[in-house]
């Protein structure tokens, strides 16, 4: 299936909105920096069939959506930006869902590499644990915002590679 051009625009919009959501200087939070162990190898796109790559992308975006839909998140960010960001994520989830339904068709392509999905989930569990340990402080959220910008950039690159495969 073709991921629509609007999908990549949505990606860019999501990244721009996430950048705009920053409230405090990243430099004032250097002491809170943390390595969350982003599973880069799951986003290089080489070892996947397309449906599996879409499933990993969906997992990444769904977990991001979950993270930014919590009450703690609502308290941390400016509401209109948060809502616009969440709307972009939701639209991407819809695009990916429609795409994978076409992709698997009746040929019954495997839908996932379970290890990849679990790697993404564990990554988000580490982020959630970090926020809990830091008591959802402004600096903790800033570190997480910067981390999600980085991981969404990896997702964007994988989506570009998928489009080149079409």
């Amino acid at each position: 299936c073709d991921l629509p051009q609007t999908h990549s625009l949505g990606n860019r919009r999501a990244l721009i909105l996430l950048a705009q959501m920053g409230r405090i200087s990243h430099f004032s939070c250097l002491k809170d920096r943390h390595d969350f162990g982003f599973p880069e190898e799951e986003f290089d796109g080489h070892q996947f069939q397309k449906a599996q790559a879409i499933s990993v992308l969906h997992e990444m975006i769904q977990q991001t959506f979950n993270l930014f839909s919590t009450e703690d998140s609502s308290a941390a960010w400016e509401q209109s930006l948060l809502e616009k960001f969440s709307t972009e994520l939701y639209q991407q989830l819809n695009d990916l869902e429609a795409c994978v339904i076409q992709e698997v068709g009746v040929e019954e392509t495997p839908l996932m590499n379970e290890d990849s999905i679990l790697a993404v989930r564990k990554y988000f569990q580490r982020i959630t644990l970090y926020l809990t340990e830091k008591k959802y402080s402004p600096c903790a959220w800033e570190v997480v915002r910067a981390e999600i910008m980085r991981s969404l950039s990896f997702s964007t690159n994988l989506q570009k590679r998928l489009r080149r495969k079409d």
Partner: antibody
Framework: EVQLLESGAEVKRPGSSVRVSCRAS????????ISWVRQAPGQGLEWMGR????????NYAQNFRGRITITADKSPLTAYLELSSLRFEDTAVYYC???????????????????WGQGSLVTVSS | EIVLTQSPGTLSLSPGEGATLSCRAS???????LTWYQQKPGQSPRLLIY???SRATGVPDRFSGGGSGTDFTLTISRLEPEDFAVFYC???????????FGQGTKVEIK
């Protein structure tokens, strides 16, 4: 684990409206849709529509468009079903249902109903 | 819109016997988007099988799902007394999201 608790039974007149609520507790996410599914006495299951509480986005089954409104509150996470212009054939048990965030991969999560409310009986009678 | 037709309408069997329930779609459905539920009298439905063949948490391994294209099956290898119920298949399609249920198969004690 998610628990879904629906409001009590209702008796309504034809032509009137009914509002059923569904309160979610446990490992809930407002980023997953909550659906409404109904079951007429002795009949099968029929999906009516769903809402994504995080954004208030709704999708309705063709059969109910124009008569159905689904809304939600994020805190506490609660979904509401309003059905208007009630007819005798709307007599049914109304269930709210939600997916599971534990389903792997998440792209399958929203395609199914892992958790169900206990059901709310709506009787339309003159 | 997809129509799911389940057969037989009723299956009369004894505990210990095997059961095969059929769900036929009016057009192709990916097995990934085919789900089975069990409903006992006076209870809410319970998720059994998703993704065509994955058992939900706590579902015994005597339940299995299979099939592809337009023909899907739910197999119960050895019926236990607690298995007698109505079973529904359900498919999903998007966009827009549409959930479709079969009319159900009742498995009753002979």
């Amino acid at each position: 684990e998610v628990q879904l608790l629906e409001s009590g039974a209702e008796v309504k007149r034809p032509g009137s409206s009914v509002r059923v609520s569904c309160r979610a507790s446990g490992d809930t996410f407002s980023s997953y849709p909550i659906s409404w599914v109904r079951q007429a006495p002795g009949q099968g299951l029929e999906w009516m529509g769903r809402i994504l509480p995080a954004l208030g986005v709704t999708n309705y089954a063709q059969n109910f468009r124009g008569r159905i409104t689904i809304t939600a509150d994020k805190s506490p996470l609660t979904a509401y079903l309003e059905l208007s212009s009630l007819r005798f054939e709307d007599t049914a048990v109304y269930y709210c249902a939600s997916p599971s965030a534990d389903i792997i991969p998440s792209i399958l999560g929203t395609t199914l109903f892992a958790f169900w409310g206990q059901g709310s009986l709506v009787t339309v009678s003159s | 819109e997809i129509v799911l037709t389940q057969s037989p309408g009723t299956l009369s069997l004894s505990p210990g016997e095997g059961a095969t329930l059929s769900c036929r779609a009016s057009q192709n459905v990916s097995r990934h988007y085919l789900t089975w539920y069990q409903q006992k009298p006076g209870q809410s439905p319970r998720l059994l099988i998703y993704g065509g063949s994955s058992r939900a948490t706590g579902v015994p391994d005597r339940f299995s799902g299979g099939g592809s294209g337009t023909d899907f099956t739910l197999t119960i290898s050895r019926l236990e007394p607690e298995d007698f119920a109505v079973f529904y298949c359900q498919s999903y399609h998007s966009p827009p999201p549409v959930y479709t249920f079969g009319q159900g198969t009742k498995v009753e004690i002979k």
